[in-house]
């Protein structure tokens, strides 16, 4: 997360970090009891490492009383999901048995409705991605609040250049922004799961160029479909 | 500060039900969920379940189901624990607490003595 | 359900003695471990989470420690406040379960 700040600790009861041989590699968001939704792309970066996920964590490195790590029985990327396309950016892992839900476990109520999010729209994106330009990464989660950007300004020349789909989301990235390390991590409405961070190469905290999110209300019959 | 009020005394006929209050003040209700403790005389603690107020979401023991219904309401800041079917064995302490991100019950009440008896 | 048995039901004890409660889980608990005290008059209080952290508050003769199955609390300096009845409580596997609990009474 750029230009953001340390976020309350476990107030965001939905977070989880996805890690592959104990290393942070993605975000993501437990949204029920046995399932992390994250960005597809994580997958590959993570070769034939045994990927868990992390929940009830603040700190990566920090021992702390709700912290913890899960392995992972079933990774189910999107099935339209490409290496060279951020098109279908999903990942559902089911975990390798239910999450113990409780202050600092919860899963995140997901949009439905596929509706567009109203331009300006203040979003919550959190993360434990690098915090700056040189590659720090924080131990602590981090988050920002940034303003939901129309898809027309999103698909200019200058910017995305018609890149992002109807499935797809942008969000202002001047100085603010989310960036490596929190693709798969979630993009939070009015307290309701929008969009998940995408999992590109994208340059992070130039404004022409923003952030993009994959609709999770666009994809809503196949995570019901993973989930039944 | 922080006060979990809970009546000291109730007492109820076999077979009858009983819904404990547990009046919260002092923070924001929904921001914590509320656990629920039993103990019977000269006995230790057993944990009956926990609730969260701001969707009401629960974990119950399995000794407890069908014993125990847990429920909040949010408007007055009081968690209640409906105990049916009672009988001598539900004779005890009950005790709600405030359960936080630590995993641990930071406030308790000063606990109700419920006494089933004809 | 995971047991958790403190086999000292009762302990006699002196003003600043340095007393040591233990506490033993049925199963590997990895350190998700709380410590709770109650006053003769019913009052319960949270002193130790995580195994090793003292709550806010708690005066600071009070330490916990353990790992794996075996735990333990320690007063380092007994004072007449301390005289209670300590409980371990275990947050690994659902159901929460508590100790039995140790009574400390004075000699």
């Known amino acids: 997360i750029l230009g953001g700040r340390e976020a309350e600790a476990h107030a965001r009861p939905y977070m989880a970090s996805v890690q592959v041989n104990g290393e942070h590699l993605c975000g993501g968001v437990l949204v029920a009891e046995q399932w992390v939704l994250s960005a597809a792309h994580c997958l590959e970066d993570a070769a034939d490492g045994k990927v868990q996920v992390l929940l009830g964590a603040h700190s990566l490195s920090q021992p702390e009383p709700s912290k913890r790590l899960y392995d992972v029985l079933r990774a189910v990327p999107h099935p339209d999901s490409r290496p060279d396309t951020i098109d279908h950016d999903l990942l559902l892992l089911q975990l390798s048995e239910k999450a113990t839900l409780g202050p600092a476990v919860r899963p995140l109520p997901w949009q439905r409705v596929d509706r567009d999010v109203e331009p300006g729209t203040l979003c919550d994106v959190a993360g434990w991605g690098i915090v700056s330009h040189a590659g720090r990464r924080p131990d602590r989660l981090q988050h920002v609040l940034l303003p939901v950007l129309d898809r027309a300004t999103c698909n200019r020349r200058t910017h995305h250049d018609g890149a992002i789909t109807q499935r797809m989301m942008c969000a202002e990235s001047n100085r603010r922004d989310s960036c490596k390390g929190d693709s798969g991590g979630p993009l939070v409405c009015g307290g309701v799961l929008e969009g998940v961070v995408t999992s590109g190469s994208r340059v992070c905290g130039n404004r022409k160029k923003p952030g993009i999110y994959t609709r999770v209300a666009s994809y809503a019959a196949w995570i019901d479909s993973v989930l039944a | 500060q922080v006060q979990l009020q809970q009546p000291g005394t109730e007492l109820v006929k076999p077979g009858a039900s009983v819904k404990l209050p547990c009046k919260a003040s002092g923070y924001t209700f929904t921001s914590y969920w509320m656990q629920w403790v039993k103990q019977r005389p000269g006995q230790g603690l057993e944990w009956i379940g926990e609730?969260?107020?701001?969707?009401?979401?629960?974990n119950y023991n399995q000794k407890f189901k069908g014993k125990a219904t847990l429920t909040v309401d949010t408007s007055s800041t009081t968690a209640y624990m409906q105990l049916s079917s009672l009988t001598s064995e539900d004779s005890a302490v009950y005790y709600c607490?405030?359960?936080?991100?630590?995993?641990?019950?930071?406030?308790w009440g000063q606990g109700t003595t419920l006494t089933v008896s004809s | 359900d995971i047991q958790m048995t403190q086999t000292t039901s009762s302990l006699s004890v002196s003003l600043g003695d340095r007393v040591t409660i233990s506490c033993r889980a049925s199963q590997d608990i990895t350190n998700y471990l709380n410590w709770y005290q109650q006053k003769p008059d019913g009052t319960v209080k949270l002193l130790i989470y995580f195994t090793s952290r003292l709550h806010s508050g708690v005066p600071s003769r009070f330490s916990g420690s353990g790992s794996g199955t075996d735990y333990s609390l320690t007063i380092s300096n007994l004072e007449p406040e301390d005289i209670a009845t300590y409980y371990c409580?275990?947050?690994?596997?659902?159901?929460?379960?508590f100790g039995g609990g140790t009574k400390l009474e004075i000699k």
């Open positions: 609730i969260d107020p701001s969707d009401t979401y629960i």
């Open positions: 409580q275990q947050y690994s596997k659902l159901p929460w379960t």
């Open positions: 607490a405030r359960y936080t991100t630590i995993m641990a019950s930071d406030y």
